[in-house]
């Protein structure tokens, strides 16, 4: 297969970093990280016609170049620039769904509503979803033992910088009405420190984006509160309004029914509020 050819061609031995080396507070690189990234790239480019011309070997070269031989607390957005370029993807800019602290439901939604896209529905997001990776300074080794934790070690680590970079670009590409799914079960429904709150909100382009529409997802079945009145949602509205983007908010009281109605909009029970 194409994947075997790639590994045959490069014959890279991915050694674990010896245990006596720097110990970080976070989990180490996901096992079989290079193979996983390449396999995901091949799969994605086979399924998505607009990305079929992308060379997965070059994508992997760009990915590893971003963090191999570099100190895992000193990664910059510039390190990821080649990967970002190769992963440039034209998604319908008016069909973007952002999310914060509610990834699974957002992904379930775009699996049904196929014309909408989360970041993880793009090549770069798909490659890295749920993976961890880091290297170490001046060696070509991948560290499978431990990687820096954002809070306990450093924020400029390979994983955090990657998601900050792709999230910024994803938000910059959005236009018209942008949707965001927020978790109404959390104490901070909108969290300024989340990727959405710290990166995406500030990189929506007012000249292209007309409205940000928040969908607040309720957790409890009997929860009939209007969570759009939550102070953190009001804070989000204020930030967005100051950026000359309109804001709207909807409560999704029954996420299970919401998904069902996306699948079957003709269902008679789908006319009532969900």
């Amino acid at each position: 297969s194409g994947l075997n050819d790639i590994f045959e061609a490069q014959k890279i031995e991915w050694h674990e970093v010896p245990r006596w080396r720097q110990q970080w507070s976070g989990p180490g690189t996901t096992k079989r990280f290079p193979e996983t990234v390449l396999a995901r790239c091949v799969k994605y480019t086979e399924i998505h016609p607009e990305m079929r011309h992308v060379d997965c070997q070059s994508v992997w070269d760009a990915f590893k170049g971003a963090f191999i031989s570099k100190h895992p607390c000193n990664i910059t957005e510039e390190d990821y620039q080649p990967l970002m370029k190769l992963g440039t993807q034209t998604v319908p800019c008016n069909k973007i769904l952002l999310w914060s602290r509610i990834k699974d439901l957002a992904h379930q939604f775009t699996q049904v509503q196929r014309d909408m896209f989360t970041l993880e529905d793009t090549l770069l997001g798909y490659l890295a979803d749920d993976l961890t990776w880091c290297g170490e300074f001046n060696t070509s080794k991948i560290n499978y033992q431990s990687c820096p934790d954002w809070r306990k070690d450093c924020s400029n680590n390979p994983v955090s910088v990657f998601w900050k970079t792709v999230s910024r670009r994803f938000a910059e590409a959005a236009c018209d009405v942008v949707h965001v799914m927020l978790n109404g079960s959390r104490s901070k429904i909108f969290d300024k420190n989340s990727t959405f709150g710290s990166v995406e909100v500030h990189n929506l382009q007012p000249e292209k984006v007309q409205t940000l529409e928040a969908w607040v997802i309720h957790g409890g079945r009997e929860d009939s509160r209007d969570l759009c009145q939550d102070p953190t949602i009001k804070e989000l509205e204020s930030i967005i309004s100051k950026r000359n983007i309109q804001f709207s908010c909807k409560n999704i009281y029954r996420p299970d029914k919401f998904l069902q109605c996306v699948k079957n909009p003709e269902d008679s029970s789908c006319t009532s509020e969900i």
């Epitope: 990305m51 390190d79 440039t88 800019c93």
Partner: antibody
Framework: EVQLLESGGGLVQPGGSLRLSCAAS????????IIWIRQAPGKGLEWVAA?????????YYADWAKGRFTVSKDNSKNTVYLQMNSLRAEDTAVYYC???????????????WGQGTLVTV | DIQLTQSPSTLSASVGDRVTITCRSS????????LAWYQQKPGKAPKLLMY???NLASGVPSRFSGSGSGTEFTLTISSVQPDDFATYYC??????????FGGGTKVEIK
């Protein structure tokens, strides 16, 4: 001052090979994408290949150029190369190298160009 | 394959005229606005005029302006000057970092 200077063009028989060079000066070579673009006589522009070398070489090609054309870079000489094999009459063109604007808001655009080198097949 | 179609292919104008060139892409450009315009004079390399559809490149006179998004874009010269008679190319940026150029519009003296 940013300068790009192409060389290596000339007359070649169909099926032959040629290596073009693009010598760069006046900027930090490793921090920019260098793109090869060609223009057939009296025709429009067409991109060929791109290369970036922050640590290792990262390169990619227009679909039509894959297999026949290879881009490479010698950082010590501040030079990018375009190796062209199995040349055909339709490859006759002026070949330019260009530097892409840097920064993610500007990628995808070419701010500095060489004067071009003519390849005749 | 991505196609960028420019119209008209040739345009005759007098000094002071307002000129508009259209560029249509067969696919939406990256970010809805990742399109550039270049000016090329005979025997010379192209020169960047506009980027991101409507941003003027450094040193380009303000009589040049750009607009459009998605698949349809225009370059306007509000009042053509003698130095503006040249060929103009649009260029889009697409998935996977691919580039495509339009076929060109030659602006000649009437």
């Amino acid at each position: 001052e940013v300068q790009l200077l192409e060389s290596g063009g000339g007359l070649v028989q169909p099926g032959g090979s040629l290596r073009l060079s693009c010598a760069a000066s006046g900027f930090s070579f490793n921090n920019y994408w260098i793109i090869w673009i060609r223009q057939a006589p009296g025709k429009g522009l067409e991109w060929v290949a791109a290369i970036y070398s922050p640590s290792g070489d990262i390169k990619y090609y227009a679909d039509w150029a894959k297999g026949r054309f290879t881009v490479s870079k010698d950082n010590s000489k501040n030079t990018v190369y375009l190796q062209m094999n199995s040349l055909r009459a339709e490859d006759t063109a002026v070949y330019y190298c260009a530097r892409e604007l840097s920064g993610s808001s500007y990628e995808g655009y070419f701010e500095s160009w060489g004067q071009g080198t003519l390849v005749t097949v | 394959d991505i196609q960028l179609t420019q119209s008209p292919s040739t345009l005759s104008a007098s000094v002071g005229d307002r000129v508009t060139i259209t560029c249509r892409s067969s696919q939406s450009v990256y970010g809805h606005n990742w399109l550039a315009w270049y000016q090329q004079k005979p025997g010379k390399a192209p020169k960047l005029l506009m980027y991101r559809a409507s941003n003027l490149a450094s040193g380009v006179p303000s009589r040049f302006s750009g607009s459009g998004s998605g698949t349809e874009f225009t370059l306007t010269i509000s009042s053509v000057q003698p130095d503006d008679f040249a060929t103009y190319y649009c260029q889009g940026y697409y998935s996977g970092g691919a580039y495509a150029f339009g076929g060109g519009t030659k602006v000649e003296i009437k």
